[in-house]
Interface confidence: low
């Protein structure tokens, strides 16, 4: 008969390292009689033999991690006892060795000039991975402002333009490397006046560029201010080239006035904004003529040849220099302003425009224009441009002019002759009378007017603006 | 290694139907858009449908509207496509493809992995 | 919808020549733009995305860039690998276009 014998491990455990998701198996050989019962343990805290996460065979000598955790780091040990002297226990490390993994990747970032950014990079690993940053395709160096901090982010202080790119960190240790996808930061810069307007002293009825030039990141947009309100004549050209915007205020000049040039960039919810201001003065302003006077004759030109009735004398205003080519000048702008509207309201617009600005004109001693009927003006603005001019209107209250669309001269309504007064005192539009039975769907419009008198128009989608000057109401 | 599988290609009859599917494995598919692009024989390529797995949002081309629709399966890292009503006209190689970030970034991202293809043919 | 018209549809050009293709879009697209380079039989493989950066791993001589709502593709020297049909894609808005491809063949 065999002798009762204690139990002495014969191959103690030893640090074990494993890869997460991989097998790691701990090796705890016993010599002993009778057979003894081995345990195991984790942190000093006992492993349950029905745990599904290990495996333990041999006779409770094999343990086996069957798929490593990273918090399976820590201190395995095997105690083994049968009974016969003393229990032993040998002990051993598993280290979790993990490949780099970056768990809070960075994001685009929008930041402006001057400020602090932090691209975040937070990575796990064992070892610990290192992490360096790439900017498009160099390997990003740290200087006094540029760092990589203890958690793998990047902090820049004191943004520069030149910062703005394509980064993307590298987390890399023994076991490999991994990539953050790349992100952009963007330098974002408060709108900045290059060059400010001049301010310039003319003659009555004299053309006149205003020219502001402004920088920022995103590009800003300019608009102007006619003695505080937007302007209300003139034409305005834009061009945008690196960065730099340049406005050109054109303005035909039978008033003195203060222009100022307000240059915005939006960052985020904020917006940043630069002003500029010149005056433009008129030599001998109080000899002017500042009283509307003029003369009846045939028209002549060619933009509204299509549109006024064959023949017919129109009232052109002396208090213009040269009347019938500055009126021309101004249907002309106006024209090309109204490339941008909806095919149903560009006719009836020109029709308005045409009419309002070369008047159907009696001669007599005094020549008198004859204005638009209000009902043919209520007519353009509330139902053939109804939707243009929303636009208009909300661009208006938030200051937003991006083109001369809101340069249109057009007429205020409320201060035409009504036709219920006198229907020979105001010159009727034909167009809006020939279109009317053409017209079968229904826009979502009000009218104060009854809806058997007026056409129903579909609503459009293009812009019309108009200068707040002449509001039709 | 990042991959995208297609499958569920073949032969159909007109008005018919087929699911393709789109199997992705090597990257973090929670946080790609998938896009279904074909080819017909000897043509261009043309967008069918898009997904964003951040949101969930769909987007199809005119062409295809109301007759495909486009899903994704998080948890089995598998976009699908589901083709009804087909035509003889949307007989071409389907491809999937990914670009990286939800559907707004991702326009700026590029395409960068696409599947090998599986060809659909409608015709009786 | 967004429409990209490329051209030309096909160019015959040397080894060691300097090619360019053009993409015109119907409407601003902002830079999302990608052009993408597809030989017979396999998938298209992405070389340029946001208008004109380079994607990882494709030659330098691929450059990419953008003049209002024209973009485009320039190989600096052509190599024989190059021949391929390319194609430019915008997803500026919500509906993705491609445009019609320009086949890069040998003179």
């Known amino acids: 008969e065999k002798l009762p014998k204690a139990p002495v491990i014969t191959t103690p455990l030893e640090t074990v390292d494993a890869l997460v998701e991989e097998v790691a198996t701990f090796m705890c050989a016993v010599e002993s009689y009778p057979q003894p019962e081995i345990s195991w343990t984790r942190n000093k805290i006992l492993i349950k033999l029905f745990d599904t996460r290990y495996s333990i065979r041999e006779n409770g000598q094999l343990l086996t991690i069957l798929s490593v955790e990273d918090s399976d780091d820590g201190i395995y040990c095997c105690i083994a006892n049968n009974g016969v002297g003393g229990a032993v226990e040998s002990c051993g490390a598993l280290q979790v060795k993990m490949k780099p993994k970056i768990t809070r990747p960075p994001i685009n970032v929008k930041i402006i000039e001057g400020l602090k950014a932090v691209l975040p990079c937070t990575t796990m690993g064992n070892p610990k991975p290192s992490v360096s940053w790439i900017k498009g395709d160099n390997a990003l160096r740290e200087n006094s402002r540029i760092a990589v901090l203890e958690s793998g982010s990047l902090r820049i202080h004191n943004v520069q333009k030149e910062d703005a790119g394509q980064y993307r960190c590298v987390a890399k240790n023994s076991l490999g490397t991994a990539y953050s996808k790349l992100v952009k930061l963007e330098v974002e810069v408060f709108a900045r006046i290059l060059r400010a307007p001049e301010s310039h002293n003319v003659t009555f009825g004299s053309f006149v560029t205003l020219r502001c030039t402004a920088i920022g990141i995103p590009v800003p947009t300019i608009s102007w201010i006619e003695n505080g309100n937007a302007v209300s004549s003139g034409s305005i050209q834009e061009s945008v080239k690196d960065r730099v915007i340049d406005s050109r205020l054109q303005l035909f000049i039978t008033k003195p006035g203060l222009y100022t040039c307000i240059a915005t960039n939006k960052h985020g919810e904020k917006f940043s904004t630069a002003k500029a201001a010149a005056t433009v003065s008129i030599a001998e302003w109080s000899k002017s003529q500042k009283d509307s006077q003029g003369y009846c004759a045939q028209y002549r030109g060619e933009v509204c040849d299509a549109v006024l009735a064959k023949d017919a004398l129109v009232f052109f205003n002396t208090s213009y220099r040269d009347p019938e080519d500055a009126q021309e000048l101004l249907i002309h702008t106006a024209w090309n302003e109204l490339k941008a509207v909806s095919p149903l309201c560009r006719p009836a617009a020109e029709a308005l425009l045409c009419n309002h600005l070369f008047q159907e004109c009696s001669p007599g001693v005094v020549p008198t224009p004859m204005p638009i009927c209000r009902e043919y003006c209520l007519a353009v603005k509330e139902l053939f441009c109804a939707k243009e001019w929303q636009a208009m209107e909300g661009k208006a209250h938030r200051g937003l002019y991006r083109s001369g669309m809101h340069l249109l001269p057009v007429p205020e309504c409320s201060k035409l002759p009504s036709m219920h007064r006198d229907p020979t005192a105001c010159t009727r539009l034909p167009y809006l009378d020939y279109k009317k039975e053409n017209i079968t769907t229904f826009p979502s419009i009000t009218s104060s007017r009854p809806s058997a008198d007026i056409p129903n128009l579909p609503a459009s989608t293009s812009s019309f603006a108009v200068s707040p000057a002449y509001s039709m109401t | 290694e990042v991959q995208l599988v297609e499958s569920g290609g073949g032969l159909v009859q007109p008005g018919g139907s087929l699911r393709l599917s789109c199997a992705a494995s090597?990257?973090?598919?929670?946080?790609?858009?998938i896009h279904w692009v074909r080819q017909a024989p000897g043509k261009g390529l043309e967008w069918v449908a898009s997904?964003?797995?951040?949101?969930?949002?769909?987007y199809y081309a005119d062409s295809v509207k109301g007759r495909f629709t486009i899903s994704a399966d998080t948890s089995k890292n598998t976009a699908y496509l589901q083709m009804n009503s087909l035509r003889a006209e949307d007989t071409a190689v389907y491809y999937c493809?990914?670009?990286?970030?939800?559907?707004?970034?991702?326009?700026?991202?590029?395409?960068?992995?696409w599947g090998q293809g599986t060809l659909v043919t409608v015709s009786s | 919808d967004i429409q990209m018209t490329q051209s030309p549809s096909s160019l015959s050009a040397s080894v060691g020549d300097r090619v360019t293709i053009t993409c015109r879009a119907s409407q601003s697209v902002s830079s999302a733009v990608a052009w993408y380079q597809q030989k017979p039989g396999k998938a298209p493989k992405l070389l340029i995305y946001?208008?004109?950066s380079l994607y990882s791993g494709v030659p330098s001589r691929f450059s990419g860039s953008r003049s209002g709502t024209d973009f485009t593709l320039t190989i600096s020297s052509l190599q024989p690998e190059d021949f391929a049909t390319y194609y430019c894609?915008?997803?500026?808005?919500?509906?993705?276009?491609f445009g019609q491809g320009t086949k890069v063949e040998i003179k």
């Open positions: 493809a990914r670009t990286y970030g939800s559907y707004y970034v991702s326009s700026y991202t590029g395409m960068d992995y």
């Open positions: 894609q915008q997803s500026s808005s919500s509906l993705i276009t």
């Open positions: 997904i964003s797995s951040y949101s969930g949002y769909t």
């Open positions: 090597g990257f973090t598919f929670s946080s790609s858009s």
């Open positions: 946001s208008a004109s």
